[in-house]
């Protein structure tokens, strides 16, 4: 039997059963999530669940830039340091940078300081690039 790999929307890339779209528009976290949802297919701001997934995403983003942080789908909706993925994925893999998680920083970004492999918390109203993900 020939198993066909699912196709992603134009301009999105495929990795291990998921499609990813990187958007260089500036959005706050909640607007970025709404925009991801607007693309359909059950898309949300991206969950990152392994180092391999993080590395693949980082390699892709590096073809555009290596200096701007990028919103991902991790947030702290209760503002109690109880982080969760907006797409409902289990919060098991963690890759926080050493920065303080204090203050009014309840949304997570991929940090450009370590080739996008580590995350930092930031104020959710900051306008940044963002990464969407869906399972085709």
């Amino acid at each position: 039997d020939i198993i066909m790999r699912p196709s992603c929307a134009p301009g999105w890339f495929y990795h291990k059963s998921n499609c990813y779209g990187y958007f260089r528009k500036l959005r706050n976290w909640s607007d970025a999530e709404l925009e991801c949802q607007s693309y359909g297919n059950g898309a949300h701001l991206a969950s990152i669940l392994s180092l391999k997934e993080a590395s693949t995403i980082a390699e892709y983003i590096s073809g555009y830039q290596r200096s701007q942080p990028i919103w991902i789908g991790l947030h702290d909706p209760q503002k109690r340091q109880q982080w969760q993925w907006i797409d409902g994925a289990m919060y098991l893999y963690r890759s926080w940078s050493g920065k303080s998680m204090g203050g009014n920083k309840h949304c997570a970004e991929m940090s450009s300081n370590n080739n996008f492999l580590t995350w930092s918390s930031n104020e959710c109203n900051k306008r940044q690039h963002f990464l969407c993900k869906y399972r085709p």
Epitope: G11, F13, Y14, E59, Y60, S62
Partner: antibody, heavy 118, light 103 residues
Amino acid sequence: QVQLQQPGSELVRPGASVKLSCKASGYTFTSYWMHWVKQRPGQGLEWIGNIYPGSGSTNYDEKFKSKATLTVDTSSSTAYMQLSSLTSEDSAVYYCTRGGLWLRVDYWGQGTTLTVSS
Amino acid sequence: QIVLTQSPAIMSASPGEKVTMTCSASSSVSYMHWYQQKSGTSPKRWIYDTSKLASGVPARFSGSGSGTSYSLTISSMEAEDAATYYCQQWSSNPFTFGSGTKL
């Protein structure tokens, strides 16, 4: 091992178009950006643009947006750059080179020497 | 787009001499690469991410800098180091090159 194979030379008439090829082997073609670089005789390097074979996403330097079109054929692991409306200014060596964040080496093709002449 | 200016354009050095060449960016960049190219051959990545030596590059080479100012240094010049060196910023697209320093 990683290899990027390019034809050695192309001779084309002014006003015509040409499609340069870069055949990749030794790695997962769809997982790395392919970049194209121009070098005129005795001159420096110019970054033309890049393409991600896994999505077809492209970026171009503004200078080359109306000159170059980057495409890939994932079935043959080949990247292409089409150059249109050729003039003598387009005579140069064109290199393909593979991107990679965590690599202590990078990979370049041998370059295709394009000559535009009547 | 970010413009990179290399200086000097041409320089010479005697064996054993310390050599420094610079690359100035028109706006701040996060990462700088350096390439070595000898006549008739493809360029080779020489220093990447500002200060990391590519595979096979002798330890006499070093790279440093931040913001808009970067440099490549050879602690003790050897004949085989004669080449043209290009800087390239990999901070934001398009990933522009400098015009080169011929050593």
